[in-house]
C-alpha cells in the first residue's frame, strides 16, 4: 500500500516527524533535488522513523546485480530490495545517521547491530562504507571490514582479493578480500544453509558458513 | 600518494593569532575523510585540536572551543588554522593530518611533517 | 574527556625482546583504538587500528589487542629501527585522546 503525499521527505525519520506513524511504502524525495523514490519505512521499531535500505527474506529476489541496479536500487520495497547507493550516499552526506542491521537466523534467533555513525562516500570513490560506533548482539567485532571498503558488484570489482569477490560470493557489497559479512549472498532455505561460502553471511554472529533467514539494514538520523 | 605540508610563521607573539596552512596534495580535501590539526608539547603530549570534514563541517576540541577556527581553501586544497590569544602554553609543534572517517573522530592515517611554533614575546 | 593512561613510560630493551606496553582507558572505548610509532624527528605514523589491525604496510611483528577499557600493543622481535615513542588514541567519543606515550629505547 503506496503512501503518498504531496510533502516532500527526505527520509523516514522526516516522514514519523510529519505524522505518519505507520509502518509502509513512502515516496522520499532526493536530497537537494526533485528526483523521487519509494522506500519502505519501519514506523515501530525502536521508536520508528528508519528508512530500510536492505531486506533480505526469502530469496524472491535476485541480488546478483550489476553496479548500476545498486546505484538505483531494485527489488520491492515490500519484500526483498535494495535501496540504492546513490540516494543512500546523498542522504548519509547530509546529516549524521546511524545505521542498524537485524538478522535472523533459522533457529529463532534474532540479533543486531548498531553503528552510532554511517555514510557512504560518493560513487566516484565506490560508495565506499565508513562506519564508526559499533553496539549490539551480533558480535562486538565488526562484520564489516573496517575502514570501510569500496563497494563490488559482479561488473564493479573494487575489491583488496586478487580474485572478484562479488562474482565468487554474488551479490555486491563492501567486500575486503572478501570479508567476514556479505548480506547480499546466494539465499538459501532451511536445511541448505550451513557450509555455504556464498550465503548470506554475518561471520561475528553466525559463523563464515551459515547463510541467514533474513536480514534488513535501516537508517535513521543520529538526533532522531 | 597523500601528502600534507604545514606551513606558517615560528614565532608568535603572546596574545596574538596563529596561524597555520595545511597543504594536501593526492587527494581532493572535498572528496572524503576529515583533516585534523593535532599539536605536540614539550614532553611529547599530543592533543587534537580539532578537523574539518570533506563536506566542510567542523568539530574542535572542548578545551579550544573559544579560541579555535578550522576553515579551508577548497579551489587551494588547503585548511587552515586559526588560534587566538594564544600564550606560551600554546608553544608546540603543530601537525596536520588526515583521518580515517569524515564524520566524526577516527585514527589519523597521513600525517605532515609538523611545524614548530613558539609563543614569546 | 576519556583519560587513556599508558604504561611504561620508559622501556629499556635489547634487539630481539618482546615488548608488550598497554593503555587503560577511563571508561569503554569499545574497540576504537589506535597505535602509533613516532620516531625521532618525524612524525606520528599509523601502525594499529581498531585496537586489532595492522595498517598497510606494517610488519607483522607489530601487534595490538583489547575491548573496552584494556588495550595492549606488542613488538615480537624488536628490532634496532623500532626506537621510538610509542602513543595509544582512542576515537571512541570526541575529542579522542592519546596516552602519554611509551619511549622505547635500545640496549
Known amino acids: 500500500d503506496y503512501k503518498d503525499d504531496d510533502d516532500k521527505f527526505r527520509d523516514c525519520a522526516e516522514v514519523f516527524k510529519s505524522g505518519h506513524t505507520t509502518n509502509g511504502i513512502y515516496t522520499l524525495t532526493f536530497p537537494n533535488s526533485t528526483e523521487e523514490i519509494k522506500a519502505y519505512c519501519d514506523m515501530e521499531a525502536g521508536g520508528g522513523g528508519w528508512t530500510i535500505i536492505q531486506r533480505r527474506e526469502d530469496g524472491s529476489v535476485d541480488f546478483q546485480r550489476t553496479w548500476k541496479e545498486y546505484k538505483v536500487g531494485f527489488g520491492n520495497p515490500s519484500g526483498e530490495y535494495w535501496l540504492g547507493n546513490e540516494f543512500v550516499s546523498q542522504l548519509t552526506n547530509q546529516q549524521r545517521y546511524v545505521l542498524k542491521i537485524h538478522l535472523k537466523d533459522w533457529e529463532g534467533n534474532e540479533a543486531y547491530s548498531l553503528y552510532e555513525h554511517f555514510y557512504l562516500s560518493s560513487e566516484e570513490l565506490n560508495y565506499r562504507i565508513h562506519l564508526k560506533g559499533l553496539t549490539g548482539t551480533a558480535g562486538k567485532i565488526s562484520s564489516i571490514s573496517q575502514p570501510g571498503n569500496d563497494f563490488s558488484t559482479k561488473d564493479g570489482d573494487n575489491d583488496k582479493c586478487i580474485c572478484k569477490c562479488s562474482q565468487m560470493l554474488t551479490g555486491g557489497w563492501w567486500f575486503d578480500a572478501c570479508g567476514p559479512s556479505n548480506l547480499n549472498g546466494m539465499y538459501y532455505p532451511q536445511r541448505q544453509n550451513t557450509n555455504k561460502a556464498n550465503g548470506i553471511k554475518w561471520y561475528y554472529w553466525k559463523g563464515s558458513g551459515y547463510s541467514l533467514k533474513a536480514t534488513t539494514m535501516m537508517i535513521r538520523p543520529a538526533d532522531f | 600518494d597523500v601528502q600534507l605540508q604545514e606551513s606558517g610563521p615560528g614565532l608568535v607573539k603572546p596574545s596574538q593569532s596563529l596561524s597555520l596552512t595545511c597543504t594536501v596534495t593526492?587527494?581532493?580535501?572535498?572528496?572524503?575523510?576529515?583533516w585534523n590539526w593535532i599539536r605536540q608539547f614539550p614532553g611529547n603530549k599530543l592533543e587534537w585540536m580539532g578537523y574539518?570534514?570533506?563536506?566542510?563541517?567542523?568539530s574542535y576540541n572542548p578545551s579550544l572551543k573559544s579560541r579555535i577556527s578550522i576553515t579551508r581553501d577548497t579551489s587551494k586544497n588547503q585548511f587552515f588554522l586559526q588560534l587566538n590569544s594564544v600564550t606560551p602554553e600554546d608553544t608546540a609543534t603543530y601537525y596536520c593530518?588526515?583521518?580515517?572517517?569524515?564524520?566524526?573522530?577516527?585514527?589519523?592515517?597521513?600525517w605532515g611533517q609538523g611545524t614548530s611554533v613558539t609563543v614569546s614575546s | 574527556s576519556i583519560v587513556m593512561t599508558q604504561t611504561p613510560k620508559l622501556l629499556l630493551v635489547s634487539a630481539g625482546d618482546r615488548v608488550t606496553i598497554t593503555c587503560k582507558a577511563s571508561?569503554?572505548?569499545?574497540?576504537?583504538v589506535a597505535w602509533y610509532q613516532q620516531k625521532p624527528g618525524q612524525s606520528p605514523k599509523l601502525l594499529i587500528y581498531?585496537?586489532?589491525n595492522r595498517y598497510t604496510g606494517v610488519p607483522d611483528r607489530f601487534t595490538g589487542s583489547g575491548y573496552g577499557t584494556d588495550f595492549t600493543f606488542a613488538i615480537s622481535t624488536v628490532q634496532a629501527e623500532d626506537l621510538a615513542i610509542y602513543f595509544c588514541?582512542?576515537?571512541?567519543?570526541?575529542?579522542?585522546?592519546f596516552g602519554g606515550g611509551t619511549k622505547l629505547e635500545i640496549k
Open positions: 593530518a588526515r583521518s580515517t572517517f569524515g564524520h566524526y573522530v577516527s585514527s589519523m592515517d597521513y
Open positions: 593526492g587527494y581532493s580535501i572535498t572528496s572524503d575523510y576529515a
Open positions: 574539518i570534514s570533506y563536506s566542510g563541517s567542523t
Open positions: 571508561q569503554s572505548a569499545s574497540n576504537d
Open positions: 581498531y585496537a586489532s
Open positions: 588514541q582512542q576515537d571512541y567519543s570526541s575529542p579522542p585522546t
